[in-house]
């Protein structure tokens, strides 16, 4: 999946551009907002009907090397007596990010940009049926 | 910083931690397996805390369309599809790294940016704040 | 056709391991959930596990939490139950099933069994 | 968990005659109960689904109904295939459990 060329709606002087490469990018890996604040309600997933853990995915080679995912922590969904309703679905909500992997081959290094999957939480839902034509 | 295993032949000059730039292939690899978008794409209806999806555009950044979530009610959905208000929806927010073209309109340059986003919508028990 | 076949069981001594097999046919797999369910002889049905499509979702019995794992293998069309610390109230007749959810969730009600496997354990 | 019990544990009846099968729940479970027949030999096969929907290729002589924790299966007319145990399930907490099943023997 190639990244699209920015639109023709601007009007860029190209001398301004740094000069790349052709078929690779420049990458500044000093994030922007780096230290925005997450203000999601408080532990929300323990007070969800749809409850879920965390756990941390540690690689040096990515960057950000760690990578939180959420895990449903049941089947169905937790009811008013505080009893698992099997009759709805805890499932995953997932979010798409970008990360920069670092690869070697030898002992040279090369950058590829990668999309990975965060599992953000989990919501109950309803199942449905699938009926057989 | 991070530090890397790294082959022992190799000249030990090159810093360990990831460079401040680097230079990346113009393709993205996509590590999604195991998951098929059609399994998930009706949840925000199917949800005991739906929620609607709304576009955001950006002809600066990477991915220029990113979808963001807005829970339909304050209560949830209870068996009866009535909107229960002793329970509440809440979003589930998620910071992500996405690509700003830096500087402005250039084709093939980028800085990473960390944004937040509301994903979906999940059902709490709302906490009853006790004042001494 | 749409078809679950069961294999696998056998005679097994109390402590001893044995992993159960289901293959399938006829049918999209990964768009189904799975599970194994027991009868005893001469007894009545007992749900054993569940798994989702892809195997995010997991369900054990109390019965056989922390000896059981449930798995599969969707480039296979393959459920299997990895059965360890047997003992002699797991002698069963197991069966592997299909749950009736779209999308690969759980409905926990089940249309399409296997003719079952069948497990002894005893010294 | 919850305990279904099934009454009676065998039901005596002639072809041509109704059977009505009982499932009682230990507390409610809405509509969340299916029923299943298992001949001897053979494996369990889904006939209602939430208490009251047939489910694929059941002929209409079976019904279900009830909510709650009172439940019925009804064959109007008993055909001599029909004469097997048959079992119902919740699904409404966890974990799915199934009632010690009702032996339907011909008379």
């Known amino acids: 999946r190639k990244i699209p060329k920015v639109g023709h709606t601007f009007f860029q002087k190209p001398e301004s551009c740094p000069p790349v490469p052709g078929g690779s990018m420049k990458l500044d890996i000093g994030i922007i907002n780096e230290n925005q604040r997450v203000s999601m309600s408080r532990n929300i997933e323990s007070r969800s009907t749809s409850p879920w853990n965390y756990t941390v995915t540690w690689d040096p080679n990515r960057y950000p090397s760690e990578v939180v995912q959420a895990q449903c922590r049941n089947l169905g969904c937790i009811n008013a007596q505080g009893k698992e309703d099997i009759s709805m679905n805890s499932v995953p909500i997932q979010q798409e990010t970008l990360v920069v992997r670092r690869k070697h081959q030898g002992c040279s290094v090369s950058f590829q940009l990668e999309k990975v999957l965060v599992t953000v939480g989990c919501t109950c839902v309803t199942p449905v049926i699938h009926h057989v034509q | 910083g991070i530090t890397i295993p790294r082959n022992p032949g190799c000249p030990n000059s090159e810093d360990k931690n990831f460079p401040r730039t680097v230079m990346v292939n113009l393709n993205i690899h996509n590590r999604n397996t195991n998951t098929n978008p059609k399994r998930s794409s009706d949840y925000y209806n199917r949800s005991t805390s739906p929620w609607n999806l709304h576009r955001n555009e950006d002809p600066e950044r990477y991915p220029s369309v990113i979808w963001e979530a807005k829970c339909r009610h304050l209560g949830c959905i209870n068996a009866d599809g009535n909107v229960d208000y002793h329970m509440n929806s809440v979003p589930i927010q998620q910071e992500i790294l996405v690509l700003r073209r830096e500087p402005p309109h250039c084709p093939n340059s980028f800085r990473l940016e960390k944004i937040l986003v509301s994903v979906g919508c999940t059902c709490v028990t709302p906490i009853v704040h006790h004042v001494a | 056709e749409v078809q679950l076949v069961e294999s696998g069981g056998g005679l097994v001594q109390p402590g001893r391991s044995l992993r159960l097999s289901c293959a399938a046919s006829g049918f999209t797999f990964d768009d189904f959930a799975m599970h194994w369910v027991r009868q005893a002889p001469g007894k009545g049905l007992e749900w054993v596990s569940g798994i989702n499509w892809n195997s995010g979702s997991i369900g054990y019995a109390d019965s056989v939490k922390g000896r059981f794992t449930i798995s599969r293998d969707n480039a296979k069309n393959s459920l299997y139950l990895q059965m360890n610390s047997l003992r002699a109230e797991d002698t069963a007749l197991y069966y592997c099933?299909?749950?009736?959810?779209?999308?690969?969730?759980?409905?926990?009600?089940?249309?399409?069994w296997g003719q079952g496997t069948t497990v002894t354990v005893s010294s | 968990e919850i305990v279904l019990t099934q009454s009676p544990a065998t039901l005596s009846l002639s072809p041509g005659e109704r059977a009505t099968l009982s499932c009682r729940a230990s507390q409610s479970v809405s509509s969340y109960l299916a029923w299943y027949q298992q001949k001897p030999g053979q494996a369990p096969r889904l006939l209602i689904y939430d208490a009251s929907n047939r489910a694929t290729g059941i002929p209409a002589r079976f019904s279900g109904s009830g909510s709650g924790t009172d439940f019925t299966l009804t064959i109007s007319s008993l055909e001599p295939e029909d004469f097997a145990v048959y079992y119902c399930q919740q699904r409404s907490n966890w974990p799915p459990t199934f009632g010690q099943g009702t032996k339907l023997e011909i008379k």
């Open positions: 099933a299909k749950d009736i959810a779209a999308a690969g969730e759980f409905y926990f009600d089940m249309d399409v």
